[in-house]
């Protein structure tokens, strides 16, 4: 955010950038936390936009019975790595096709075993404040799927009639590893020493992270004419003088007409 | 990549004999390799299956007729098919699996590598 400033009096603001604003030859330049002339004012919003998708990933195991491990699998540019590649791809593809997060799997290992193929599956999911349900949700299913292809599809009198062959019991679940993104932790830590008066809302599935000072929302402060200011001690309204009132308060709800104290005056003198 | 190009397709009457040959741009040795066929408006379906190690599958349709065969050195694989029918009448096309492509003497596993075909009409 920055503020441009005109004449002889720039050069006095620019020893006054406050905040660690930092002067540019016209203006302050002002951290992401502050705006203003100086750099003197608390920004009533941060941005901290989510992601458009949250991923996970999980680190499974199975034993493919169809194929007969060579060495040559262990090298991934190799003609047999590459096709195994291919139809295990296509395997996957075809038991996860129900799974809307699903995004694809990758191989990270073959070894001997008949053939265990150590592979990620991929999930994606469009960011909502459900995201980790819904990714929940999909890694179950996956479980659900990979056990029921590798209980079905096996070798029966030394046959594979399926696309693949699995050993039922080399099917394993390592690992699952989900994005973490906490809309409320990243608020805290942007807002830093002001982050106890920052809060999350959401709007359309969107978190905003305001201060009481940003209008709209559920915790926005009402300053009637003033104006909400953020400080250390979190945040205040400033109260307006017009030309006829003198307004105070807490939310400078309580106006004072300015006759009727100048006339008081008057009457004493 | 294996390229698959089949040849000695034609027109034959009831009762006669046809031989099919694939020729592969690959090695098919470490390979299944399989023939599939495809009569206008139906299915594809398997057709005969030979493994790495020789032993063959037939189609119920087609046991007693047809003999599938593979010579490793040539990269070839046949189809002699005897005593042909109407019923014959198809697009036939060779199919080779994975490298190292174990179990599978029946014909229902999908090979990664297919041909363009080659037409066999039994007709009088």
């Known amino acids: 955010r920055t503020t441009t400033c005109f004449g002889d009096g720039c050069q006095n603001t620019a020893s006054r950038c406050k905040n660690g604003g930092t002067w540019d030859g016209l203006k302050c330049q002002c951290p992401n936390l502050y705006y203003g002339e100086l750099c003197e004012e608390v920004v009533s919003s941060i941005d901290i936009g989510p992601p458009e998708t949250i991923s996970a990933q999980m680190e499974l195991t199975v034993t493919v019975t169809s194929v007969k491990f060579t060495e040559e699998l262990k090298n991934h540019s190799s003609q047999e790595f590459q096709e195994f590649k291919q139809t295990f791809t296509e395997q996957m593809n075809i038991v996860y096709s129900g799974i809307p997060e699903y995004v694809g799997v990758n191989i990270t290992k073959l070894r001997l075993g008949s053939v265990v193929v150590e592979h990620d599956v991929l999930l994606r999911t469009k960011y909502t404040p459900e995201y980790k349900t819904v990714l929940d949700n999909a890694t179950e299913v996956v479980k659900e799927k990979i056990t029921k292809v590798t209980t079905q599809q096996i070798m029966i009198n030394d046959i594979c009639s399926d696309m693949m062959c699995f050993n039922t019991t080399g099917t394993q679940v390592q690992n699952i590893t989900v994005t973490q993104y906490d809309p409320e932790e990243d608020c805290r830590k942007m807002a830093k020493e002001y982050g106890d008066y920052f809060v999350v809302e959401y709007r359309d599935q969107k978190p905003y992270c305001i201060s009481p000072c940003e209008p709209g929302f559920s915790v926005s402060k009402n300053c009637n004419l003033g104006k909400c200011q953020m400080s250390l001690s979190g945040p205040q309204c400033l109260c307006v003088t017009t030309e006829t009132h003198w307004y105070s308060g807490e939310t400078c709800n309580q106006g004072t007409q300015k006759s009727l104290v100048y006339g008081h005056h008057h009457h004493h003198h | 990549e294996v390229q698959l190009v089949e040849s000695g397709g034609g027109l034959v009457q009831p009762g006669r004999s046809l031989r099919l040959s694939c020729a592969a741009s690959?090695?098919?040795?470490?390979?299944?390799m399989g023939w599939f066929r495809q009569a206008p408006g139906k299915e594809r379906e398997g057709v005969a299956g030979?493994?790495?190690?020789?032993?063959?599958g037939y189609a119920d349709s087609v046991k007693g007729r047809f003999t599938i065969s593979k010579d490793n050195a040539k990269n070839s694989l046949y189809l002699q098919m005897n005593s042909l029918r109407a019923e014959d009448t198809a697009l036939y096309s060779c199919?080779?699996?994975?490298?190292?492509?174990?179990?599978?003497?029946?014909?229902?596993?999908?090979?990664?590598?297919r041909g363009q075909g080659t037409m066999v009409t039994v007709s009088s």
């Open positions: 690959g090695d098919i040795t470490r390979r299944c």
């Open positions: 030979i493994s790495e190690d020789g032993i063959t």
């Open positions: 199919a080779a699996s994975i490298l190292n492509r174990v179990g599978c003497r029946q014909l229902s596993y999908e090979y990664i590598y």
